[in-house]
């Protein structure tokens, strides 16, 4: 029960985290005009990974996309790449984790397979979260070190191409969304990895013991076997709790491991 809860919670936390990473990546407010010297401005500038915007007092907002790839600074490209990798890994992780959820039955999937999938998705969530945190941190570091003095817009400013009025930029809302979202995805991933340990069976699990009652062909299978009437008719039933992927008839080939009445 605790394993299912941990796995489910990890999935939900990661889902929220990845949604946050997507939101942060799409947001325009990665950096916003620093209003320290002029808190009452008639023109407010803010910039994202994909475009820069200007909001006027009149209420009009104009956004211009960065319609160049080669002209953009390497650091911005790196941040974009980190965020996209984070989103892709997170999305794949979510897809994998859906099938790995203990509460969802898919065919005759073994718990060992679910454990592996849970671990895989957990690792993906961890890497996704780290990518997001790294991307946001690189951008924040860029803001702190350069403080974007005299920028015309993001790509010319960071390249130092245009010298205009000093417009200082500070952390935008997207950075905080990104940090929190990355952290949540990371936590979700850790929870999935913890859940995986609970899903994976111990190697010391007892193998099935068949009790042959006289006059009946009923095999009693303690340790998680599904009971079946007769051996012949149900030889391909998979075990629920077992480290390997052996079938019942394979188990039956080891008589020394069984006590018969």
């Amino acid at each position: 029960m605790a394993v299912t809860a941990c796995q489910g919670l990890g999935f939900v936390v990661s889902l929220i985290g990845i949604a946050g990473i997507i939101a942060a990546t799409c947001m325009d407010q990665w950096s916003t005009q620093d209003l320290y010297n002029n808190p009452v401005t008639a023109v407010f500038n803010y910039q994202g990974l994909w475009r820069s915007c200007v909001r006027e007092s009149s209420g009009f907002t104009e956004c211009r996309g960065y319609f160049t790839l080669l002209g953009l600074p390497a650091m911005l490209q790196a941040v974009r790449a980190l965020m996209i990798v984070g989103i892709v890994l997170g999305a794949i992780g979510l897809l994998v984790s859906i099938f790995a959820l203990k509460c969802i039955r898919i065919g005759s999937m073994e718990d060992s397979a679910k454990a592996n999938m849970t671990l895989t998705s957990g690792i993906m969530f961890i890497v996704s979260g780290l990518c997001a945190i790294a991307g946001v941190s690189v951008f924040a570091n860029m803001l702190v070190t350069n403080f974007w003095m005299s920028t015309a817009n993001m790509y010319t400013g960071m390249g130092g191409m245009v010298q205009t009025v000093q417009t200082r930029y500070t952390f935008g809302a997207a950075l905080f969304v990104g940090w929190v979202a990355g952290g949540l995805t990371l936590i979700g991933g850790v929870m999935m990895c913890i859940a995986c340990r609970g899903l994976a069976p111990e190697e010391t699990n007892y193998k099935a013991v068949s009790y042959h009652a006289s006059g009946h062909s009923v095999a009693y299978k303690p340790g998680g076997f599904k009971a079946s009437t007769g051996f012949g008719s149900n030889t391909k039933n998979k075990k629920i709790y077992d480290g390997g992927a052996r079938t019942e008839d394979e188990v039956q080939s080891y008589p020394s491991k069984h006590d018969y009445v």
């Epitope: 008639a42 023109v43 500038n45 915007c53 006027e56 009149s58 009009f60 817009n153 205009t164 009025v165």
Partner: antibody
């Protein structure tokens, strides 16, 4: 055609109060930030106040801060300017204006005269 | 506060001739975010409210004749009337639309010579 019609002007004694109104028609009033601008006889234009479209932000020059209050009622398409502690130097024609792109005052009313005198 | 200084105070130009009005701001009106200059030009005829002519220093308002043009960047701006018409007689004002408080120039009175 866009119409802005100011009212409420008149003669008032120093220290007195007055409330100006500006009724808007033929444009989406709620989408526009609005301003009051005044012009003393024979003088240059002087910006008095601005209010954002959503009523959340108001701006004033130091000369009127604390004495004048700009407000709006989007349901009535009306802009207001409450003027308290009036001084002789507040005597002017008061215009209301709608802000467009570039923070430019795109639409103007005909103005209402406020005279502060004892 | 940004101080707007217009020159000349008055100008007399013959019909059909070019009229040039200058405006200087104490601080740059160029916004780095969109590379636009937040300077506006207005025309005010006697007994009338001002009329918007040009915003963003060079963008003509719809309905304004194309003989009116604006130019300049940073702190120095110019309003040009390429061929003066009788109806252009008015006072012209420049305005800082970049930062509060919005400030206007002293105005230039344009007359026919």
């Amino acid at each position: 055609e866009v119409q802005l019609l100011e009212s409420g002007g008149g003669l008032v004694q120093p220290g007195g109060s007055l409330r100006l109104s500006c009724a808007a028609s033929e444009f989406t009033f709620s989408n526009y930030a609005m301003s009051w601008v005044r012009q003393a006889p024979g003088k240059r234009l002087e910006w008095v106040a601005t209010i954002s479209s959503g009523r959340s932000s108001t701006y004033y020059p130091d000369s009127v801060k604390g004495r004048f209050t700009i407000s709006r009622d989007n349901s009535k398409n009306t802009l207001y300017l409450q003027m308290n502690s009036l001084r002789a130097e507040d005597t002017a024609v008061y215009y209301c204006a709608g802000l467009g792109r570039g923070n430019a005052m795109e639409y103007w009313g005909q103005g209402t005269l406020v005279t502060v005198s004892s | 506060d940004i101080v707007m200084t217009q020159s000349p105070d008055s100008l007399a130009v013959s019909l059909g001739e070019r009229a040039t009005i200058n405006c200087k701001s104490s601080q740059s009106l160029l916004n780095s975010g969109n590379q636009k200059n937040y300077l506006t030009w207005y025309q005010q005829k006697p007994g009338q409210p001002p009329k918007l002519l040009i915003y963003w220093a060079s963008t003509r308002e719809s309905g304004v004749p194309d003989r009116f043009s604006g130019s300049g960047s940073g702190t120095d701006f110019t309003l040009t009337i390429s061929s003066l018409q009788a109806e252009d007689v008015a006072v012209y004002y420049c305005q800082n639309a970049y930062s509060y408080p919005f400030t206007f120039g002293g105005g230039t009175k344009l007359e026919i010579k």
